[in-house]
Structures are given as structure tokens and as C-alpha cells.
């Protein structure tokens, strides 16, 4: 059974992941980003279902494509290199979803833009955090 300390740790990790995802979204979804139009042409796979921590497998599998799109951004827009940013996210995702059980991610039929993709995972984090608090 999860202890209060493990719940607190999970909550903090989710909050960290949430802030990282929001920071990426903030860096790209504004008029000053010269590559926004180009970035919006890239398609991301969305989870068919995302209600539990194990579903973070679907986010993990899209981190490489996310890094590739972020590499289009100007360096001034990100005070962390995309590689480092994605690496940080990957570490948190691995800890949160755990490695005990292998989960096969199911994707929705419709693909999404990077903005829709990030918003979906931001909503996921907010939703799980709200159940923990």
C-alpha cells in the first residue's frame, strides 16, 4: 500500500513534470517563436487512455520526437538545451511509471500537434495531482 511519504514523493515528481511540460509549451506557443508554424506541422501520437501513472509509457515513447521538434527552436528560447530538458523529463517519467510491469501503450487514431500533445499531458499531470491532494 502506498505510504504518505511515497504519495508525497509522487506528487512532487508530478509537479516537477508538470512544470517542465508547461515550460516547454510556454517556450513554443507564442508569437515570438519563428518556428511555431513549422513545429505545428509535426504530428504526435496521443494516448487512447491516460488516467494512471502506467500510461506515462505513452509519453515516454514520444519524448524522442518531442526532442527533435524542440531542436528547431532558437537557443535563446530555451535556457536548458532540449536534450537536457528531455533527459530530465525522461528520468521523472521512468520513476513515476515504474519498471516492474511492462505496459503496452495504446494510441488514439488521431494524431495531434505539439501544442495539443503537451496540453494533453499537462492535463494528465494536473488530474493525477488533484487525486493525490
Amino acid at each position: 500500500a502506498p505510504t504518505s511519504s511515497s504519495t508525497k514523493k509522487t506528487q512532487l515528481q508530478l509537479e516537477h513534470l508538470l512544470l517542465d511540460l508547461q515550460m516547454i509549451l510556454n517556450g513554443i506557443n507564442n508569437y515570438k517563436n519563428p518556428k511555431l508554424t513549422r513545429m505545428l506541422t509535426f504530428k504526435f501520437y496521443m494516448p487512447k487512455k491516460a488516467t494512471e501513472l502506467k500510461h506515462l509509457q505513452c509519453l515516454e515513447e514520444e519524448l524522442k520526437p518531442l526532442e527533435e521538434v524542440l531542436n528547431l527552436a532558437q537557443s535563446k528560447n530555451f535556457h536548458l538545451r532540449p536534450r537536457d530538458l528531455i533527459s530530465n523529463i525522461n528520468v521523472i517519467v521512468l520513476e513515476l511509471k515504474g519498471s516492474e510491469t511492462t505496459f503496452m501503450c495504446e494510441y488514439a487514431d488521431e494524431t495531434a500537434t505539439i501544442v495539443e500533445f503537451l496540453n494533453r499531458w499537462i492535463t494528465f499531470c494536473q488530474s493525477i495531482i488533484s487525486t493525490l491532494t
Epitope: L25, N26, I28, N30, K32, K76, N77, F78
Partner: antibody
Framework: QVQLVESGGGVVQPGRSLRLSCAAS????????MHWVRQAPGKGLEWVTV????????YYADSVKGRFTISRDNSKNTLYLQMNSLRAEDTAVYYC???????????????????WGQGTTVTVSS | DIVMTQTPLSSPVTLGQPASISCRSS???????????LSWLQQRPGQPPRLLIY???NRFSGVPDRFSGSGAGTDFTLKISRVEAEDVGVYYC????????FGQGTKVEIK
Amino acid sequence: QVQLVESGGGVVQPGRSLRLSCAASGFTFSIYGMHWVRQAPGKGLEWVTVIWYDGSNEYYADSVKGRFTISRDNSKNTLYLQMNSLRAEDTAVYYCARGSYYDSSGYYFGEDFDYWGQGTTVTVSS
Amino acid sequence: DIVMTQTPLSSPVTLGQPASISCRSSQSLVHSDGNTYLSWLQQRPGQPPRLLIYKISNRFSGVPDRFSGSGAGTDFTLKISRVEAEDVGVYYCMQVTQFPTFGQGTKVEIK
């Protein structure tokens, strides 16, 4: 000093078109992004659209997408807003506002919405 | 879109007394460049808006030092240390971290 003067407002029937202008002076217009913001009677502020310093990129609020077009003529220091298929809910005071400036290093600097025009009133009514 | 929520919506104050307006964003306003693009605007009756504060706490040129901004992340505050008659109007918080959005406005009036 920085000055922004809007014109072109008026009363128009639903479905018709109107073109607003914003004449800029007192700064190097051609390096600044520019915004249009509107305010319905007795209501708050709503961002409408923005255009890049050179006109190469433009973005719109969902409420006006496909109906409004922002443009600029840097040789005339003038910003425009072409409004088509007007609706009653487009009734508002329309303000132009200065955005950030584009530096030769390829980045935007400065503050958005640091200077505003006095506004021009658009009334959509049959 | 990022939703900006202001409280209170109306603030009757006594001349010479302090006033405070809160603003909360639906998500973090920290940009990937490290800045937080949260501004405060003042709109006096019958006038266009005017920039008071940018990037949380920086006063725009010509703005009196009785105006100050603070906050971080999603929670921000505008304070007027001693309200003067010319401060009457509506105050808006706005974010330009993503595409711009405004708070609903807070009406400051004299009691």
C-alpha cells in the same frame, strides 16, 4: 514620443466588412511586432491578432480566425485590420498596441503592449 | 489558452490607504527562457489601457513607485501603497508568455 492613432471605425451591418488603420509615429515601426486588442462595451480586454515586424507571421484569436486579417505597410508606418463577415459580437473599441522589437541578432526584445492607441469604435448593428 | 483570474473584481478604497489586487493563471507563466511574462495594465475611465508593470515586478517608465508587483509561477499581486484620486480605474493582469490573455479586470474606486 510614441504615438498610435487608429481610424476606420463606424457603424456597419452584420455580414459586411470594415478596414481599420493604425498610424504609428515616434519609433522605428518596421522592427516592432504589432497587436490589435478589442474591448466590448462595458467589458474587459480581448486580444485579437498580432503581426510580425516584417509581416511574415500573423496569429489570431479563435473568435476572429478566418474573418479578420492583419497586415502592415512599413513604408507608411501603418498597421491594418481587415474585418469581414462582421457579427454583433464584434462590436467594440479596437486598439492597436505595440509589441516587442526584433533585433538584428534574430530575437525579440522589449515589452509587449507598452504603448496603446486611443481606440476606434466599431458597431455592428442592423 | 491560459486563463487569468483576478480577485477582487471591485475594490473600494480610502484615499491614502493601500490597495491590493490578486491574479492567478491557470498554468505556470514561466517561459523556457527563464522569464515570467506577467504584466499589469491600468485603464482610467474613458482612456485606453496603459502599461504599469511588466515581467512581474518591473515598473514601466513614468509609473509612480507607489505601484509594485510581486509573485511567481501562477500567483501574482499588484499593490498600490497609498491610493490617490488619479488611480481610480480598472486594473488588468495579462500574460504574454503564450498568446496574450487578460484577467477580467478589477475596478478600483474611492469609498
